[in-house]
Interface confidence: low
């Protein structure tokens, strides 16, 4: 019968010929009366056999990531008779892995959006690197992730590549961050290879800013001849948020005379002061009203940012019109 051990050849061997092992028949008494032959893909070009001894050699540098095993056939012939001594046998040469591939991030570019003011621990995105080396061969393809850029706002879980928030961020101060993640194989041990990727993390807006009046005092005038419904002026608040989080509603907080109203222009986000009742200079020539402004949409959990709505005082002077 055939006698052999399992055959392994390390990939990327630079020697011109590398001894892999020996194939032999147990009928071979060592007197050179048998001839060994190698058949199959790679026989003669990649692998050769010593016809007399059955020793097998790799004569080419192999790349496991290109091909990890070779299935060959062996024959042994009695030189004197030309007949097969053993039935032809199939055997396998496995190419063993070395750490010759760095981790690669295949899904880049990475981009994620996360709400500003998200708490520590909030999951942002998972980055995944792949390593063409053999995952079953030691630590060649066992990866560890680390953060090269992005502290103190982000952290990465070393074994999963999950990026999390580690410090609260305010979109109004900075609305996007570049995070650089490194993946190292060999679980970071000496000889490790590494790859990096960049992640663009954009902060989406949350309603953490209330609208605030630009002025604490406005002065407007109204002619006593103005009809009801007349727009007598505008007031304006600003809100550091964006989109619907910056949409606001103006209203009257105090107007004992019930003479004025404020409507909101939702396109310009201005408050328009409207005359609700006609005024008479001789009866009253000035008015003081207080207006307030609030955001249109405020989730209940963000109400703490919207306590005590911003207010402003509006002084309204009535202009006299000569009466006939």
């Amino acid at each position: 019968g055939w006698v052999w051990n399992q055959f392994f050849v390390p990939e990327e061997m630079n020697t011109t010929s590398h001894h892999i092992g020996q194939l032999r028949s147990d009928l071979d008494n060592g007197n050179n009366s048998f001839q060994y032959k190698l058949l199959g893909a790679g026989a003669g070009s990649t692998f050769i056999i010593d016809e007399r001894t059955g020793d097998i050699y790799a004569i080419q540098k192999l790349d496991r990531e290109e091909r990890s095993l070779y299935i060959l056939r062996a024959q042994v012939i009695d030189i004197a008779t030309g007949r097969a001594v053993e039935p032809e046998s199939e055997f396998v040469i496995k190419v063993s892995d070395i750490n010759d591939n760095e981790p690669k991030f295949l899904d880049e570019p990475y981009e994620a959006i996360v709400p500003e003011m998200s708490p520590e621990g909030t999951l942002v995105i998972q980055v995944t690197a792949s390593d063409a080396d053999d995952p079953s061969s030691g630590n060649n393809a066992r990866l560890l992730y680390s953060l090269l850029q992005g502290q103190p706002y982000f952290s990465v879980e070393p074994t999963t590549g999950v990026i999390r928030i580690s410090s609260k961020m305010d979109r109004e101060l900075q609305d996007e961050y570049w995070v650089i993640i490194q993946a190292k194989d060999m679980i970071g041990q000496p000889g490790a290879l590494s790859g990096t990727t960049s992640v663009l993390i954009k902060l989406s807006d949350v309603n953490d800013n209330k609208p605030i009046f630009k002025e604490s005092l406005y002065r407007l005038t109204v002619s006593e001849s103005a009809p009801t419904g007349t727009s007598i002026g505008t007031i304006m608040a600003y809100d550091n948020d964006i989109g619907e989080n910056a949409e606001m509603d103006y209203s009257i907080e105090e107007d004992d005379s019930q003479t004025f109203d404020i409507i909101t222009n939702h396109e310009t986000q201005e408050g328009i002061v409207i005359l609700k009742k006609k005024v008479d200079f001789e009866h009253q020539n000035h008015y003081g009203i207080r207006a307030k402004v609030k955001n249109h949409h405020v989730p209940e959990q963000l109400m703490k940012y919207h306590t005590e709505a911003s207010t402003t005082f509006i002084k309204i002077q009535v202009e006299d019109v000569d009466e006939p």
Epitope: M117, P119, E120, S167, K168, K210, P299, E300, Q301, M303, K304, Y305, T307, E308
Partner: antibody, heavy 119, light 107 residues
């Protein structure tokens, strides 16, 4: 270590004033909204006031609005509660508490200072 | 304001037993913005649970929170001697209010 230490409590007559202080250490005080919470003897907890991390906004419970003023000095890592027009029902242990970075619940409390309003 | 009602007022149990504390809100607590605190005599409250069910840092896993809307529960799976204390629920979705407390005492 990370801690809050209140001081300034004592006995005061109705209508009187007191100023409580809360010294913070071991964390970035200026990054956190801070609150006062009180507990009357043998009673439950009652939220009193909040001040934003930068002092820009303050909010009070109805029971103290107009009488108490919350303030902070971020350069000295200190929170204050100025209590005027004190009433007997203000008698309580006053705790300062830190709101979490996430916001809204309290992850760090001081040991409290007792305010007794009595004639 | 949202009123929180805790029950029972007092719970008498032995070490090793399971404790179930209830907290009911007068209206729905937005997005489960509910916390639980433990307070021992002469000490400041200590955060146990936030977001109705998330354990605070350093809190043993025998403490668990559940519930949503108006009904919330704090469960202590096996009472240890150090767990006998007063427990408060707190909502933080609309201003801040606390329940009146449940005292867990040794039977």
């Amino acid at each position: 270590q990370v801690q809050l230490v209140e001081s300034g409590g004592g006995v005061v007559q109705p209508g009187g004033s007191l100023r409580l202080s809360c010294a913070a250490s071991g964390f970035s005080f200026s990054s956190y909204d801070m609150d006062w919470v009180r507990q009357a003897p043998g009673k439950g907890l009652e939220w009193v006031a909040v001040i934003w991390y930068d002092g820009s906004n303050k909010y009070y419970a109805d029971s103290v609005r107009g009488r108490f003023t919350i303030s902070r000095d971020n350069s000295k890592n200190t929170l204050f509660l100025q209590m005027n027009s004190l009433r007997v029902e203000d008698t309580a242990v006053y705790y300062c508490a830190r709101e979490t970075g996430e916001g809204w619940y309290f992850d760090l409390w001081g040991r409290g200072t007792l305010v007794t309003v009595s004639s | 304001e949202i009123v929180l009602t805790q029950s029972p007022g007092t719970l008498s149990l032995s070490p090793g037993e399971r404790a179930t504390l209830s907290c009911r809100a007068s209206q729905s607590v937005s997005s489960s913005y509910l916390a639980w605190y433990q307070q021992k005599p002469g000490q400041a409250p200590r955060l146990l649970i936030y977001g109705a069910s998330s354990r605070a840092t350093g809190i043993p896993d025998r403490f668990s929170g559940s519930g949503s809307g108006t009904d919330f529960t704090l469960t202590i799976s096996r009472l240890e001697p150090e767990d006998f204390a007063v427990y408060y629920c707190q909502q933080y979705g609309s201003s801040w209010t606390f329940g009146q407390g449940t005292k867990v005492e040794i039977k």
